[in-house]
Amino acid sequence: AGVFELQIHSFGPGPGPGAPRSPCSARLPCRLFFRVCLKPGLSEEAAESPCALGAALSARGPVYTEQPGAPAPDLPLPDGLLQVPFRDAWPGTFSFIIETWREELGDQIGGPAWSLLARVAGRRRLAAGGPWARDIQRAGAWELRFSYRARCEPPAVGTACTRLCRPRSAPSRCGPGLRPCAPLEDECEAPLVCRAGCSPEHGFCEQPGECRCLEGWTGPLCTVPVSTSSCLSPRGPSSATTGCLVPGPGPCDGNPCANGGSCSETPRSFECTCPRGFYGLRCEVSGVTCADGPCFNGGLCVGGADPDSAYICHCPPGFQGSNCEKRVDRCSLQPCRNGGLCLDLGHALRCRCRAGFAGPRCEHDLDDCAGRACANGGTCVEGGGAHRCSCALGFGGRDCRERADPCAARPCAHGGRCYAHFSGLVCACAPGYMGARCEFPVHPDGASALPAAPPGLRPGDPQRYL
């Protein structure tokens, strides 16, 4: 567990020509607030997908009134940090969306109105416990400068906030087998967890997730004895000239794996695949609980509060195995059609399509613009073998033959009313909702669901999206 912290340093016009008009005026004073949305992994989902790592809303900044004729300066910002608590491990790679919202405070019927001024997004690598990282992002003519960091909440420590520290049991030293935590010398580190299945007799580790073998043993889990003979086949060659003895039964005969483990022969010995809750060379060791941290790669451990009840690891996308120790190679199933390139991003699959093909799995064959007419003043746009019709306002469909009614799909959520507009559509939200599609509920106490609305609104305040 821990907290992602975001500090906004400035929001104002970016460098270069075309400085944006001030968002506030003497007639319509306004103030800014910010929303951050975090997702695990290097995600490429749309802005509307859930903020799986969490989201937060800033306080509202000071009221700002434009000075007539003056260029838009850096706008006054809310005080304090935006903090996004995370309950599980910090993923190390994450995607963010930071939105700058404007709250207009003019004499409007029904109270203030909100509109989205700018949205920036990015993908970053970040270790928990590290220093503040500085960033600059541009959205149109606006520029946002900010810093961010992830920090662990005690008792968690480490770059992923997965190691646990406990207060010392005695003032003089940590208990037997426990050492002080590096950043917190007055606390003690909880026991280390090696790679799942690492032999408790022949393997050891000094870093989480590793498995080093004692002399005489080998294999990823130190379950294979090192052979001293020169025999190369599993049972040894039958030729007497090699000087190798040929053992009779195979290593899996009689199934040496206890507790329902299944045996498979290896070049020198055997390996047991153990059921959940057992490990060791012959699956002889039981008593693993969630307290032992058996789930790797950010897996969530459920059950197993005592040694007699089995635990279950709920693996994040891209991992499998009883301890989430195996990375799933979903590209081996060749899901991308028509020669598309498969990218396994861990949290999701992506297909990079060859020119002339499109769709999530490159399943759509696109023609080019040759001999193709787009109706009602639409223009055919060609790009690397693909085509599409860019339709004039008020028309849609593959060939721009359909008259477009932007409100036909009922895009306004929660009872919002839709109005067709020359530039698209406008949603007039029902009381208690805000956002481009009335998708954000506003709660009376200022708290809000994710994504959230600005604090301090009363339930009866009608919301307008400008």
Partner: nanobody, 127 residues
Framework: DVQLVESGGGSVQAGGSLKLSCKSP????????MGWFRQAPGKEREGVAA????????LYADSVKGRFTISADNAEKTVYLQMNTLKPEDSAMYYC????????????????????WGQGTQVTVSS
């Protein structure tokens, strides 16, 4: 709670022998490592020998290889350390340690591996 009780320490001349015992009266350790550690005044704790209960692995520090032997009698809930050809540098407080549940964290001669310890027995070797 798991208790470990060491005995067998004492004073001996260089070249002599001692046999240390570590008994667990309250708990039968069916699998996992048990080890012997020692600490001389002003020095770091040092792993001496370890044995895997329920397996066949024994490990020794280089300084005692060929002179010390670790063994276990599970029926008696006891682990032994037979120390032969003792040297003055073997003088120290000797501690017995056990894993309550076996796991692979840390080398068997690393004290961090163990979560139960005895109170120790003193060994003094004079020249």
């Amino acid at each position: 709670d798991v208790q470990l009780v060491e005995s067998g320490g004492g004073s001996v001349q260089a070249g002599g022998s001692l046999k240390l015992s570590c008994k667990s009266p309250t708990y039968t350790i069916s699998s996992g490592y048990m080890g012997w550690f020692r600490q001389a005044p002003g020095k770091e704790r040092e792993g001496v020998a370890a044995i895997y209960i329920g397996g066949s692995t024994t490990l020794y520090a280089d300084s005692v290889k060929g002179r010390f032997t670790i063994s276990a009698d599970n029926a008696e809930k006891t682990v032994y350390l037979q120390m032969n050809t003792l040297k003055p540098e073997d003088s120290a407080m000797y501690y017995c340690a056990a894993q309550l549940r076996p796991n692979s964290a840390y080398h068997p001669l690393d004290g961090r591996k163990y979560n139960y310890w005895g109170q120790g027995t003193q060994v003094t070797v004079s020249s």
